[in-house]
């Protein structure tokens, strides 16, 4: 569950469970910075634009990221 960028890190909770890529509107990877010392992965869902925070250390999430980037590279010319 993310917040506005005015606070330090964005996420309230992080999940080890991957989201369904078909339910996904957008996947953001926010690198560590002076505002937040850790990488944050924010999934924006199609329904209500709900945002979910994913655990970058989770194996399942790493697999999701691979699948999404594979899908994107297929689509790009």
């Amino acid at each position: 569950v993310p917040l506005s960028r005015t606070v330090r890190c964005t996420c309230i909770s992080i999940s080890n469970q991957p989201v369904n890529p078909r339910s996904l509107e957008k996947l953001e990877i926010i690198p560590a910075s002076q505002f937040c010392p850790r990488v944050e992965i924010i999934a924006t869902m199609k329904k209500k634009g709900e945002k979910r925070c994913l655990n970058p250390e989770s194996k399942a999430i790493k697999n999701l990221l691979k699948a999404v980037s594979k899908e994107r590279s297929k689509r790009s010319p």
Partner: antibody, heavy 119, light 111 residues
Framework: QVQLVESGGGVVQPGRSLRLSCAAS????????IHWVRQAPGKGLEWVAV????????FYADSVKGRFTISRDNSKNTLYLQMNSLRAEDTAVYYC????????????WGQGTLVTVSS | NFMLTQPHSVSESPGKTVTISCTGS????????VQWYQQRPGSSPTTVIY?????PSGVPDRFSGSIDSSSNSASLTISGLKTEDEADYYC??????????FGGGTKLTVL
């Protein structure tokens, strides 16, 4: 199985302080945002505060802002609520509750601890 | 500030259907998800509906949730009422995330 056990409640005089604890087990505490919710005797639920999984973000209800402080120790799987300048209207059962892993609802609640503010 | 208003109490006979409303003011109720919590006397709350209309595992399909944008309200419907359904029910949403808002609660009496 998931367990949340609150402690630290009791009778305290107005203006004094009290610290509540919530011991967690059965889930990855360091991944979970945790809330405090209270319930005055015979009344409804009132949200008090939330802390992010890593302790970097804290948010409070207007009614407790500046008086209550939420914190956590992930090495001890424990959540805290430091309550200062207590008022009679803070008398309530205080529950800690965890956010569901992948969503925005409270899937587990503690049994609650009663705080009575009275002279 | 976003607020949620519920009827103080409702009552119905066993086997019947009851609907508890939760009306939003100060904002659109369909902007965020709505949850419903059940609290039996002397117990902690438990979730019966999350994300508007989803049931956690273990909650019977007699419980259903819906949103009506035109009336800016959410509803919890319990069909085939049982005496064990007698409890207080609270709706909850956000103002905005992560600030939580609860409705005042509705006492359900199963006659």
């Amino acid at each position: 199985q998931v367990q949340l056990v609150e402690s630290g409640g009791g009778v305290v005089q107005p203006g004094r302080s009290l610290r509540l604890s919530c011991a967690a087990s059965g889930f990855t505490f360091s991944n979970s945002g945790i809330h405090w919710v209270r319930q005055a005797p015979g009344k409804g639920l009132e949200w008090v505060a939330v802390i992010s999984y890593d302790g970097s973000n804290k948010f409070y209800a207007d009614s407790v802002k500046g008086r209550f402080t939420i914190s956590r120790d992930n090495s001890k799987n424990t959540l805290y609520l430091q309550m200062n300048s207590l008022r009679a209207e803070d008398t309530a059962v205080y529950y800690c509750a965890k956010l569901r892993d992948n969503g925005e609802y409270l899937d587990y609640w503690g049994q609650g601890t009663l705080v009575t503010v009275s002279s | 500030n976003f607020m949620l208003t519920q009827p103080h109490s409702v009552s119905e006979s066993p086997g019947k259907t009851v609907t508890i409303s939760c009306t939003g003011s100060g904002g659109s109720i369909d902007r965020n998800y709505v949850q419903w919590y059940q609290q039996r006397p002397g117990s902690s709350p438990t979730t019966v509906i999350y994300e508007d209309n989803q049931r956690p595992s273990g909650v019977p399909d007699r419980f259903s949730g819906s949103i009506d944008s035109s009336s800016n309200s959410a509803s919890l419907t319990i069909s085939g009422l049982k005496t064990e359904d007698e409890a207080d029910y609270y709706c909850q949403s956000y103002d905005p995330l992560p600030v939580w808002v609860f409705g005042g609660g509705t006492k359900l009496t199963v006659l």
